[in-house]
């Protein structure tokens, strides 16, 4: 138990903690006053974003455009960066005042809308140190954290949470499913100084836990004892042959026998056809391979379990969560089918503020976005039905014309004339 716990025990201290929003842990005691907003981007100033975001200098990379897409909740508020060219790499980044998350919570949040019904493409962000050359950001550029949805074919529909730990990108051991519909979704990553994390989609928790448990940052705490090996006489057989069981004397019968009912055909010529042999049939008395009865093995010791020892290589690291320097947020993606819109970027140290910001942005426009999409779908259905009706009408008309063309020409006569004609002929 930490001495801090003793230090902070006393009347009304919980209230003080609440009022001052103090968070404390065994390793760190820190005050969290006003939320620090390190980066926020909502694209509300028209083309202003072009001066804040830097593109990689490469002609064959895809272009981002400012758009709210084909459907939206609010045309202005829902404007974001949209990928606009199919089968392209995209590289765009924005810098901010460098900061360290040591001793404090880190929250990364943004919205993604795959309105193109994405088949293969990234929807994730990367947080880089400020040492990144933004004009040369690429797939191998070293980042601190990569977070967000990724879809590619039927096999990949996941939320990546990757930390660069001691120079190596370490993937989460859990499978977090991302949203794969056409609507805007809010993705949030929370990393806390007690080495815990939380992933939220649409402001609801989808995963949480400890960094040490859910990533392979550190060697395992326990390893198999290298000096231990299964004893020679360790018997893992649960059942053995009954030594008292023996094969019955009449057991061995051939599998096939000559058909006793078969007769040599009368026209069989031994000189021409060779010696006649009756066809063989399955022997009804054949019993197959004899196997002795199985009994419980009196020497059975169970499955040998390799004993484990403390791993001498293991030592805990209370600062897995911490990075000295965050300075750039980047979109470094590949998209087969373009159309994804990124918006409402936020990097802060305050979970409550992030949730509030999510509710005030994504939360406010999501219902109207769905409404507009539903309306468009309904209109499309109606148009499709109208087109189908028109097509059917045209087909019927064409069929009638064809029938008229095909049938032999008859003189047009009134019914009365035709009937009279019939009588006369009769």
């Amino acid at each position: 138990s930490s001495s801090l716990e003793v230090l902070f025990q006393g009347p009304g201290l919980n209230d003080i903690f609440e009022a001052q929003k103090i968070e404390w842990h065994e390793e760190n005691l820190y005050f969290q006053g006003e939320p620090a907003v390190y980066f926020k981007e909502q694209f509300l100033d028209g083309d202003g974003w072009t001066s804040r975001w830097i593109e990689k200098h490469k002609s064959d990379f895809g272009k981002f455009v400012l758009s709210s897409g084909k459907f939206y909740g609010d045309e202005e508020k829902d404007k974001g960066l949209q990928t606009s060219q199919d089968a392209r790499f995209y590289a765009l980044s924005a810098s901010f005042e460098p900061f360290s998350n040591k001793g404090q919570t880190l929250v990364v949040q943004f919205t993604v809308k795959h309105e193109q019904n994405i088949d293969c493409g990234g929807g994730y962000v990367k947080l880089f140190p400020n040492s990144l050359d933004q004009t040369d950001m690429h797939g191998d550029s070293e980042y601190n954290i990569m977070f967000g949805p990724d879809i590619c074919g039927p096999g990949t529909k996941k939320v990546h949470v990757i930390f660069n730990y001691k120079g190596k990108n370490v993937l989460i051991n859990k499978d977090i499913r991302c949203k794969d519909d056409e609507f805007t979704h809010l993705y949030t990553l929370i990393v806390r100084p007690d080495n815990t994390y939380e992933v939220k989609i649409d402001n609801s928790q989808v995963e949480s836990g400890s960094l040490e448990d859910d990533w392979d940052f550190l060697p395992p705490k326990k390893i198999k004892d290298p000096d231990a090996s299964k004893p020679e006489d360790w018997d893992e057989r649960a059942k053995i042959d009954d030594p008292t069981d023996s094969k019955p004397e009449d057991w061995d019968k051939p599998e096939h026998i000559p058909d006793p009912d078969a007769k040599k055909p009368e026209d069989w010529d031994e000189e021409m056809d060779g010696e006649w042999e009756p066809p063989v049939i399955q022997n009804p008395e054949y019993k197959g391979e004899w196997k002795p009865r199985q009994i419980d093995n009196p020497d059975y010791k169970g499955t040998w379990i390799h004993p484990e020892i403390d791993n001498p290589e293991y030592s805990p690291d209370p600062s897995i969560y911490a990075y000295d320097n965050f300075g750039v947020l980047g979109l470094d993606l590949w998209q087969v089918k373009s159309g994804t819109i990124f918006d409402n970027f936020l990097i802060t140290n305050d979970e409550a503020y992030a949730e509030e910001f999510g509710n005030e942005t994504w939360g406010v426009t999501k219902a109207a976005e769905k409404q507009m999409k539903d309306k468009q779908d309904e209109e499309q259905r109606t148009r499709r039905m109208m087109r189908t009706k028109m097509r059917m009408r045209r087909m019927r008309r064409t069929r009638r014309k064809m029938r008229r063309k095909m049938s032999p020409a008859r003189p047009r006569t009134s019914c009365r004339e035709a009937c009279l004609q019939g009588w006369t002929e009769a």
Partner: antibody, heavy 127, light 107 residues
């Protein structure tokens, strides 16, 4: 799991080109990435390049840039490797190898290693 | 360009532990894969991402990676483990293989 079957052995003249095919079965072709690796007699493995069919783009080892073309035909689930301006040093066994896509970036393919290999195609370059 | 260095050969007595190393500048920051290749056959992936075993690969095969050296460890070596072993990494959008190590199981 995907299986990879390569085309048969080839004997080529110096200066000519060779095109080796690698047909995938037993999996969704677009969910895999294909690499081409060669091995000269008595030598080690050498990566030539790779393609992710769903991307439609290939990337190549610097050594082979301009001389190798890797393509994929999704309709027949077949990847191809064409090597031009052949010389005697190109005599080798050429392997295609695949790994399942785990994401939309190039690095995902290589992050998990190449877990399925073709049987190899022997290409002999001799005058 | 990035280089991986492997010893040309390693010998081990049956039942003992063989260790094959793969050296590279700060290799510990990269993901290392190991392949086994028997004469006349295609390579087989035995370890991916430093220490993960694909299904069907015996537990006797393990891997580690830190600093400037990655290691493939084969415990309780058997005659059937005799093969060439290659390490591999991904660096600067390129796949790099080590030169290979011939493992001989004595006896």
């Amino acid at each position: 799991e995907v299986q990879l079957v390569q085309s048969g052995a080839e004997v080529k003249k110096p200066g000519s080109s060779v095109k080796v095919s690698c047909k995938a079965s037993g999996g969704t072709f677009s969910s895999y990435a294909i690499s081409w690796v060669r091995q000269a007699p008595g030598q080690g493995l050498e990566w030539m390049g790779g393609i992710i069919p769903i991307f439609g783009t290939a990337n190549y080892a610097q050594k082979f840039q301009g001389r190798v073309t890797i393509t994929a035909d999704e309709s027949t689930s077949t990847a191809y490797m064409e090597l031009s301006s052949l010389r005697s040093e190109d005599t080798a066994v050429y392997y295609c190898a695949s790994s399942p896509l785990r994401g939309s970036g190039w690095y995902w393919h290589y992050y998990y290693g190449m877990d399925v290999w073709g049987q190899g195609t022997t290409v002999t370059v001799s005058s | 360009s990035y280089e991986l260095t492997q010893p040309p050969s390693v010998s081990v007595a049956p039942g003992k532990t063989a260790r094959i190393t793969c050296g590279g500048n700060k290799i510990g920051t990269k993901s290392v894969h190991w392949y086994q290749q028997k004469p006349g056959q295609a390579p087989v992936l035995v370890i991916y991402r430093d220490s993960n075993r694909p299904s069907g690969i015996p537990e006797r095969f393990s891997g580690s990676n830190s600093g400037n050296t990655a290691t493939l460890t084969i415990s309780r070596a058997q005659a059937g483990d005799e093969a060439d072993y290659y390490c591999q990494v991904w660096d600067s959008s390129t796949v790099v293989f080590g030169g290979g190590t011939k493992l001989t199981v004595l006896g």
